[in-house]
């Protein structure tokens, strides 16, 4: 659910961390309508996720830890 690189809504699916290679943050005050986490998957898809949802926070935390440990 994205338009001109802006997420317009959120996925209703839950993704596994093994499916995700990275993420970018979309901020509502930087030209887009909503805050979002954009997950980049191993299948080269971009998935818009709700940053308030627990599973999204969990994956963001996991990926952030990985980057810190590199």
């Amino acid at each position: 659910a994205s338009n001109f690189d802006c997420c317009l809504g959120y996925t209703d699916r839950i993704l596994h961390p093994k499916f995700i290679v990275g993420f970018t943050r979309q901020l509502a005050n930087e030209g887009c309508d909503i805050n979002a986490i954009i997950f980049h998957t191993k299948k080269k898809l971009s998935v818009c996720a709700n940053p308030k949802q627990t599973w999204v926070k969990y994956i963001v935390r996991l990926l952030s830890k990985k980057v810190k440990n590199m």
């Epitope: 839950i14 993704l15 596994h16 499916f19 949802q53 627990t54 599973w55 969990y58």
Partner: antibody, heavy 120, light 107 residues
Framework: QVQLVQSGAEVKKPGASVKVSCKAS????????MHWVRQAPGQGLEWMGV????????TYNQKFKGKATLTVDTSTSTAYMELSSLRSEDTAVYYC?????????????WGQGTLVTVSS | DIQMTQSPSSLSASVGDRVTITCRAS??????LNWYQQKPGKAPKLLIY???NLADGVPSRFSGSGSGRQYSLTISSLQPEDFATYYC?????????FGGGTKLEIK
């Protein structure tokens, strides 16, 4: 120890609704998902949907959208699964099961199951 | 949705045998796969998570392997209590899907 205790067997008429409960104990209820899985007589396992008790976020198997409704009561650490417009093919054992992302999103503890029989 | 195909659907074996059950996904699931054991009239029990990790309390005769689309569960030396039905499960993305099950029976 972790326990999921489900409500007892139900017999319902076609068109009716049923609400199955799942009382959790032995862990922090809001820290783990609660999944619901269906098993028709003599058949395999079918994932219905999941609820995050911390914020009541739900996602469903498309097949069960409009058929099943998942809710939680965090004050009593209880999850509920309501089935509406029952038909004979909804006759099955329904399981609640804890989803643990610490063990690779696995379902690590299961309720004992609730048999729902739909019969006229 | 990701389809999970288990084989064989049933298997006869003897105590002490080594048995392997396989599970094939319709697409790459990157190791996001779990295995469960179910005995008649009982709830399933988690055996293996993340394709290769043994769940708490599960005997070491059980092992999981595989990657990509192809996974397997091996029991190195069958015990009488191992005769049950085994299911694989994809957890890469919802809807989570189970294999059709493998019923392991005494020969």
């Amino acid at each position: 120890q972790v326990q999921l205790v489900q409500s007892g067997a139900e017999v319902k008429k076609p068109g009716a609704s049923v609400k199955v409960s799942c009382k959790a104990s032995g862990y922090t209820f809001t820290n783990y998902w609660m999944h619901w899985v269906r098993q028709a007589p003599g058949q395999g396992l079918e994932w219905m949907g999941v609820i995050d008790p911390s914020d009541s976020y739900t996602t469903y198997n498309q097949k069960f959208k409009g058929k099943a409704t998942l809710t939680v009561d965090t004050s009593t650490s209880t999850a509920y699964m309501e089935l509406s417009s029952l038909r004979s093919e909804d006759t099955a054992v329904y399981y609640c099961t804890r989803g643990n992302y610490g063990v690779d999103y696995a379902m690590d503890y299961w309720g004992q199951g609730t048999l729902v029989t739909v019969s006229s | 949705d990701i389809q999970m195909t288990q084989s064989p659907s049933s298997l006869s074996a003897s105590v002490g045998d080594r048995v392997t059950i396989t599970c094939r996904a319709s697409e790459n699931i990157y190791g996001a796969l779990n295995w469960y054991q179910q005995k008649p009239g009982k709830a399933p029990k988690l055996l293996i998570y993340g394709a290769t990790n043994l769940a708490d309390g599960v005997p070491s005769r059980f092992s999981g392997s595989g990657s990509g689309r192809q996974y397997s569960l091996t029991i190195s030396s069958l015990q009488p209590e191992d005769f049950a039905t085994y299911y694989c499960q994809n957890v890469l993305i919802t809807p989570y899907t189970f294999g059709g099950g493998t019923k392991l029976e005494i020969k």
